[in-house]
């Protein structure tokens, strides 16, 4: 279904791995802060599956939720756990796998647009002639059936960074993911300052390239917290 495809195509905010620097390839992508959209789903991060310490569901991958690994365990020690499939018990939406949501303690299919904040996607079939507007007819479809660019090149639809050519990563572009260039030295990157924000950035950037990390630009140290500019810099 479109709903589940869109869920699987999403990327979410991800803090740097423990002991790692933001902008490390393990951090998946970087995103412009403060762009929020309504929604109750959870989002994908990086493509490895080792246990990841977390404080909330939004820090986990699309097929995971954040909880204590043992029943009745120490709430202070939480990791990303595998999502629950249809008809499994749940306590909240995030526990259910993409395409499902938690209803009356059971994961059920969310094919019928159950989320109030769900965004309609209009797939347009042609570019109209009037000011090049996207003015085709709209229909519901899956993303997997349509690739608008050669696989792996910049602008290609992707699911993970391994789908993209060298020098590109798979980053969010609205409710899809496309291959975008990995950031070079001096390019603007994003440090996630607003931990706990449940919004999702719509326009994401890739991580900083090899040997680079996302750090505050020296001449911006005096700037206010909200306007500090981060760039990819040599370690």
């Amino acid at each position: 279904t479109l709903n589940s495809v869109l869920n699987s195509n999403a990327i979410k905010n991800l803090p740097p791995p423990l002991g790692g620097a933001a902008g490390h390839p393990g951090s998946a992508v970087s995103a412009a802060p403060g762009i929020l959209y309504p929604g109750g789903n959870k989002y994908q991060t990086i493509d490895n599956y080792q246990p990841y310490p977390c404080a909330e569901d939004e820090e986990c991958g699309t097929d995971e939720y954040c909880a204590s690994p043992t029943r009745g365990g120490d709430a202070g020690v939480q990791i990303c756990l595998a999502c629950r499939k249809r008809r499994k018990r749940c306590m909240r939406h995030a526990m259910c796998c993409p395409g499902n949501y938690c209803k009356n303690g059971i994961c059920v299919s969310s094919d019928q647009n159950h989320f109030r904040g769900e965004i309609e996607e209009t797939i347009t079939e042609s570019f109209g002639n009037d000011h090049s507007t996207l003015d085709g007819y709209s229909r519901r479809t899956t993303l997997s059936s349509k690739m608008y660019h050669t696989k792996g090149q910049e602008g290609s639809v992707c699911l993970r960074s391994s789908d993209c050519a060298s020098g590109l990563c798979c980053a969010r572009h609205f409710w899809s993911k496309i291959c975008k260039p990995v950031l070079k030295e001096g390019q603007v990157c994003t440090k996630h300052r607003r931990k706990g924000s449940h919004g999702l950035e719509i326009f994401q950037r890739c991580y900083c390239g090899e040997g680079l990390s996302c750090r505050i630009q020296k001449d911006h140290h005096q700037a206010s917290n909200s306007s500090r500019l981060h760039t990819c810099q040599r370690h």
Epitope: A32, E121, T122, T124, L134, G155, H173, F203, R205
Partner: nanobody
Framework: EVQLVKSGGGLVQAGGSLRLSCAAS????????MGWFRQAPGKEREFVAG????????YYADSVKGRFTISGDNAKNTVYLQMNSLKPEDTAVYYC??????????WGQGTQVTVSS
Amino acid sequence: EVQLVKSGGGLVQAGGSLRLSCAASGRTFSSYGMGWFRQAPGKEREFVAGISWTLGRTYYADSVKGRFTISGDNAKNTVYLQMNSLKPEDTAVYYCASDESDAYNYWGQGTQVTVSS
């Protein structure tokens, strides 16, 4: 330096219409797409509508679906938001932003839209 120049905000009666436009100038690289966002007093900035040049798609928030229409001209680096059947709850500062291939996401200055009942 890229600048996003907006126009079209203002005060309108409930049920009325406004058209916002946002033009990017100074760009020497391509854009993947552009979007409109809004922020009402005391609330988070939220997505309103978006247009993807790369994918040939438009996107709308549920709250504006059927009332707002986004369109644009990639060649002219311009995006428009036609807002019809405006409601008091549409009152906010509206921003446009672009998803750029040079990795920087450019934001325009906000434009105030006030819908009176």
